[in-house]
């Protein structure tokens, strides 16, 4: 019962997390105009991964898409890639986890298959969450760097017009949505992995039998016992986790292929 609850909760948490990642990716408020120097502006700027917007105090908002691919900063391309990879992995993970749910019966699917599917979806959720967190963090780092660069430009007198034209940007709502959503997906993935341990059927273990020889009191246990006990040191399961780690590395390094696009 606890396993089913853990699996179900993991699924729900991941579902909310992935919905949040999708929402964050689509949102326009990744960076918003810093109003510290001009709190009474009649024109408010904000930017997303796909377009930039200007909201006038008259109530009108105008958004323009980034219609160029080659002209965009490599970092922005990397963030886009990380978010998309996170969404794709999360979506596949959700699909897999639906079939893995203990409360859903599909034909004569064995518990071991469900356990493997639960583990697979869990790893996918973990990697998906990490991708989202990484993407948002890279963008946030970019913002912080640009913020302090533009602040330096304002106060070190790099030409009169630099100060007046430059618009400083700070963290937008999408960053916080992305961080929270990535965290939820990560937590959901961990819960799925934990549920997997309880789902896997314990192999029938022979009870240790003591053979008392005359003059000796040595206990003998069947040789294969330790190697076959559940998840104690199951190398098969370890490989799955290692595979997950490698997948995560591949996902993290994937966007760098597009750095020079």
């Amino acid at each position: 019962m606890a396993v089913t609850a853990c699996q179900g909760l993991g699924f729900v948490v991941s579902l909310i997390g992935i919905a949040g990642i999708i929402a964050a990716t689509c949102m326009d408020q990744w960076s918003t105009q810093d109003l510290y120097n001009n709190p009474v502006t009649a024109v408010f700027n904000y930017q997303g991964l796909w377009r930039s917007c200007v909201r006038e105090s008259s109530g009108f908002t105008e958004c323009r898409g980034y219609f160029t691919l080659l002209g965009l900063p490599a970092m922005l391309q990397a963030v886009r890639a990380l978010m998309i990879v996170g969404i794709v992995l999360g979506a596949i993970g959700l699909l897999v986890s639906i079939f893995a749910l203990k409360c859903i019966r599909i034909g004569s699917m064995e518990d071991s298959a469900k356990a493997n599917m639960t583990l697979t979806s869990g790893i996918m959720f973990i990697v998906s969450g990490l991708c989202a967190i990484a993407g948002v963090s890279v963008f946030a780092n970019m913002l912080v760097t640009n913020f302090w660069m533009s602040t330096a430009n304002m106060y070190t007198g790099m030409g009169g017009m630099v100060q007046t034209v430059q618009t400083r940007y700070t963290f937008g709502a999408a960053l916080f949505v992305g961080w929270v959503a990535g965290g939820l997906t990560l937590i959901g993935g961990v819960m799925m992995c934990i549920a997997c341990r309880g789902l896997a059927p314990e192999e029938t273990n022979y009870k240790a039998v003591s053979y008392h020889a005359s003059g000796h009191s040595v206990a003998y246990k069947p040789g294969g016992f330790k190697a076959s006990t559940g998840f104690g040191s199951n190398t098969k399961n370890k490989k799955i986790y290692d595979g997950g780690a490698r997948t995560e590395d591949e996902v993290q390094s994937y966007p760098s292929k597009h750095d020079y696009v």
């Epitope: 009649a42 700027n45 105090s57 008259s58 109530g59």
Partner: antibody, heavy 118, light 113 residues
């Protein structure tokens, strides 16, 4: 077509208050900010403040902040500007003007002359 | 507050001639987000309310004759009437739409020479 019709001329004594109305027609009154601008005789234009009738949100010029109150009645599509503690230098023509795309004032009322005299 | 200074205060031009009015801002009116200058030009004829002529420094309002044009960016702007007509006798104002409080220039009175 868009029309802004203001109330008639007023003569007030110093220290009193005046309330000028501006009735809008021909557009969705609640969806556009309404500005109030004044013009003293032979002088330039001076922005006083604005209201968003949809939620009653207001913005005022610091010069008039303590003396001006801008309100709106959505049921009658009317905006109001009340100026208190009147002084002789408040003698001016008061205009209401719709705020539009580009942060411009695209339609103006005909103006209301307020004369402050003892 | 953004201060707009218009020059000259008054201008006398012959019919059919070019008239040029300048407006200088104490701060930039160029918005980096959309690269638009939030400067507006109005025409006010005697006894009438102001009329919108040009917004975003150079975009002509519909119905405004094409002899009116606006130019400039950042802090320096110009309103040009290419061929002055008798009905252009008016006071012209520039307005800041970039920052509160919304401010106007002191006005330039255009007269017929």
């Amino acid at each position: 077509q868009v029309q802004l019709v203001q109330s008639g001329a007023e003569v007030k004594k110093p220290g009193s208050s005046v309330k000028v109305s501006c009735k809008a027609s021909g557009y969705a009154f609640s969806n556009y900010w309404m500005n109030w601008v004044r013009q003293a005789p032979g002088q330039g234009l001076e922005w006083m403040g604005q209201i968003y009738p949809g939620n009653g949100d207001t913005k005022y010029s610091g010069k008039f902040n303590s003396r001006v109150t801008i309100t709106a009645d959505k049921s009658t599509n009317t905006a109001y500007m009340e100026l208190s503690s009147l002084r002789s230098e408040d003698t001016a023509v008061y205009y209401c003007a719709r705020f539009y795309y580009g942060n411009v004032m695209d339609y103006w009322g005909q103006g209301t002359l307020v004369t402050v005299s003892s | 507050d953004i201060v707009l200074t218009q020059s000259p205060d008054s201008l006398a031009v012959s019919l059919g001639e070019r008239a040029t009015i300048n407006c200088k801002s104490s701060q930039t009116l160029l918005n980096g987000g959309n690269q638009k200058n939030y400067l507006t030009w109005y025409q006010q004829k005697p006894g009438q309310p102001p009329k919108l002529l040009i917004y975003w420094a150079s975009t002509r309002e519909s119905g405004v004759p094409d002899r009116f044009s606006g130019s400039g960016s950042g802090t320096d702007f110009t309103l040009t009437i290419s061929s002055l007509q008798a009905e252009d006798l008016a006071v012209y104002y520039c307005q800041n739409g970039y920052s509160y409080p919304l401010t106007f220039g002191q006005g330039t009175k255009l007269e017929i020479k």
